[in-house]
Interface confidence: low
């Protein structure tokens, strides 16, 4: 229904706390360099204005669209051009072009320092002094670093953060209470960020149809007892929610997500038997829980898929008369039978099925042509299964750090032109798949591994798009989203690459490395490893292992030495010489 004042409508629906949080996220995601105080001031002004519209929907400007209201606020910021350069040109445009312009200027890799967590006492003090401001800072800092973070989900993580602080700040040993809990939230939030970015990429590059196909597959796996109409309705609603969030319409997105959660909880009987525990929770927890709910038990009496999609005499007629619905039904039926497949694999199978029908339905004897289509799926299924087995075996043998290093070597060989920080970040993220997925029960490994890898590779593509340097990466990133992972997996050593010359300073280290946290130490070592591979792309695993073991031994020795500086300055050059010799 149309509302006289959109801003009043959203304020009433969401309530002041969520309204303010979402407006803060929106501003922080658009203008990523502004300070918290600048954004907080704008949020307060917008909130005060919303309240006047709630009191009187006919008041001046209350009938304006949210994009107009928010855009006008952003464009009124002083020194916009000095701080944001050509983003200021967006302000010369009218809606909806102005908002599109803001979206295009979102930076996936803003040059902001890492979000450092203060020590426990300081955190608890500022949290107790002003919990609202503290959580505002959290929303601001996360949103500006992750400009596509799913806004209602970020409110959920802020709520988790709040609960953890409330509990831990009351304890004697705050540090040991806070650290593991906040680390857990951080890990989940980072995964949530890359997953949502993938959804927005799908929406931006391939449109709503592509996203809806993803949603149908995912929902069919989770709710195999829901009928196709129910799945389609949920997929349509979910597509709308994600389109709004990816498009910066965060108030609408959060409101519609709450509506979707309400609908699901009111219609459990036709959706899934597993929703009740989620539905008993308050709003943010409920929506989060529904998004991660376990798969319902598959119906026992499902007929073979071939009956409707291969053996039926009307296959080509069905396909010709309702392509999208027929393919959607195929995707639904196949997905609900295979919770053990990744969504990416299911979409590849649906694409193969579509291509087969396109070809066969134009032939003289279609059934003879498409009769073998399900058998032709076999290599498509085997490929990711082998990938999971190979990589999980390697992870189990090497552990997370060693597995990351193996991936780093592999990807540096595939795309040596890519910057070392990007390669290290990608390899570290890709390597976490082991810890995240390889320990799961067998039937959950493939979906976990492949869908996670796809999301990480999407980030690689986004960063590479900014400064394209590798033809290999460009080739894999240009294709369809679901083909990316197999494309990257199939890449081999880039034969066109001219090895980097050996620079001693790249492998020169100082005593300050000794005091770094373990994670930072690992990054330093992995940076050196990537540089070694760039110097010798065809170095054997044995050669690289020798050098890295020597390097680890060198660090261990010098970090234990009484005079660390002298040890680093004398032993360092010897290490460099040994490295060169080992790789010669």
């Amino acid at each position: 229904e149309a509302h006289k004042s959109e801003i009043a409508h959203r304020y009433n629906d969401l309530g002041e706390q969520h309204f303010k949080g979402l407006v803060l996220i929106a501003f922080s995601q658009y203008l990523q360099k502004c300070s918290y105080d600048e954004h907080a001031k704008l949020v307060q002004e917008v909130t005060d204005f919303a309240k006047t519209c709630v009191a009187d929907e006919s008041a001046a400007n209350c009938d304006k669209s949210l994009h107009t209201l928010f855009g006008d606020k952003l464009c009124a910021i002083p020194n916009l051009r000095e701080n944001y350069g050509e983003l200021a040109d967006c302000c010369t445009k009218q809606e909806p072009e102005r908002n599109e312009c803001f979206l295009q200027h979102k930076d996936d890799n803003p040059s902001l320092p890492p979000f450092e967590r203060p020590e426990a006492e300081a955190m608890c003090t500022s949290f107790k002094e002003n919990p609202t401001t503290f959580m505002g800072h959290y929303l601001h800092e996360v949103a500006r670093r992750h400009p596509y973070f799913y806004a209602p989900e970020l409110l959920y993580y802020a709520e988790q953060y709040n609960e953890i602080l409330t509990q831990c700040c009351a304890e004697a040993d705050k540090e040991s209470c806070l650290t593991p809990k906040l680390d857990g939230v951080k890990e989940k939030a980072l995964v949530s960020s890359v997953r949502q970015r993938m959804k927005c990429s799908s929406m931006q590059k391939f449109g709503e149809r592509a996203f809806k196909a993803w949603a149908v597959a995912r929902l069919s796996q989770t709710f195999p007892n829901a009928d196709f109409a129910e799945i389609t309705k949920l997929a349509t609603d979910l597509t709308k929610v994600n389109k709004e969030c990816c498009h910066g319409d965060l108030l609408e997105c959060a409101d519609d997500r709450a509506e979707l959660a309400k609908y699901m909880c009111e219609n459990q009987a036709t959706i899934s038997s597993k929703l009740q525990t989620c539905c008993d929770k308050p709003l943010l927890k409920k929506a989060h829980c529904l998004s991660e709910v376990e798969h319902d038990t598959m119906p026992a009496d499902l007929p073979a898929i071939a009956a409707d999609f291969v053996e039926d005499q009307e296959v080509c007629k069905n396909y010709a008369e309702a392509k999208d619905v027929f393919l959607g039904t195929f995707l639904y039926e196949y997905s609900r039978r295979h919770p053990d497949y990744s969504v990416s694999l299911l979409l590849r199978l649906a694409k193969k099925y579509e291509a087969t029908l396109e070809k066969c339905c134009a032939e003289a004897n279609p059934p003879a042509c498409y009769g073998t289509v399900l058998a032709e799926f076999q290599p498509l299924v085997e490929e990711p299964k082998n990938l999971v087995k190979t990589n999980c075996d390697l992870y189990e043998k090497l552990g997370e750090y060693g597995f990351q290093n193996a991936i780093l070597v592999r990807y540096t060989q595939k795309a040596p032109q890519v910057s070392t920080p990007t390669l290290v970040e990608a390899a570290r993220n890709l390597g976490r798949v082991g810890t995240k997925c390889c320990t799961l029960p067998e039937d959950q490994r493939l979906p976990c591994v492949e869908d996670y890898l796809s999301a990480i590779l999407n980030r690689v593509c986004l960063l590479h798009e900014k400064t394209p340097v590798s033809e290999h990466v460009t080739k894999c990133c240009s294709g369809s989203l679901v083909e990316r992972r197999p494309c990257f997996s199939a890449l081999t050593v880039d034969e066109t690459y001219v090895p980097k010359e050996f620079k001693a300073e790249t492998f020169t280290f100082h005593s300050d490395i000794c005091t770094l946290p373990e994670k930072e130490k690992q990054i330093k070592k992995q940076t050196a490893l990537a540089e070694l591979v760039k110097h010798k792309p065809k170095a054997t695993a044995e050669q690289l292992k020798t050098v890295m073991d020597d390097f680890a031994q060198f660090l261990d020795t010098c970090c234990k030495a009484a005079d660390k500086d002298t040890c680093f300055s004398t032993e360092g050059p010897n290490l460099v010489t040994r490295c060169k010799d080992a790789l010669a």
Partner: nanobody, 126 residues
């Protein structure tokens, strides 16, 4: 540090039921992956059932599916294993295990669980 204490074991006739409990301290049980394992005399320790943290995703060994139910009571910080239709081959020492590093991940591999209870003996015999 997580401490786990199992209880509820005992002697039961075939076809009977038992409910095992595992009280946790040092960590909220809904934030960690927890599982039940069992070890029969002279055999390897085997996975029985598991439940993920944060989201109540449950896992079962094929041999107990439909007979055993894993659950937890967050307010009591306790994990349960309801065992129905017990068979003589269910005789074993039952252990509760926790894996706080991966709150959502339940694994069937015993080595991946750093925290264990001392076990409770279940004997199914007529």
């Amino acid at each position: 540090e997580v401490q786990l204490l199992e209880s509820g074991g005992g002697l039961v006739q075939p076809g009977g039921s038992l409910r095992l409990s595992c009280a946790a301290s040092g960590r909220y049980i809904d934030e960690t992956a927890v599982a039940w394992f069992r070890q029969a005399p002279g055999k390897e320790r085997e996975f029985v059932a598991g439940i993920g943290g944060g989201v109540d995703i449950t896992y079962y060994a094929d041999s107990v599916k439909g007979r055993f139910t894993i659950s937890r009571d967050n307010s009591k910080n306790t994990l349960y294993l309801q065992m129905n239709s017990l068979r003589p081959e269910d005789t074993a020492v039952y252990y509760c295990a926790a894996r706080p590093g991966s709150p959502l991940i339940t694994s069937k591999v015993a080595d991946l669980y750093p925290y264990w209870g001392q076990g409770t003996l279940v004997t199914v015999s007529s």
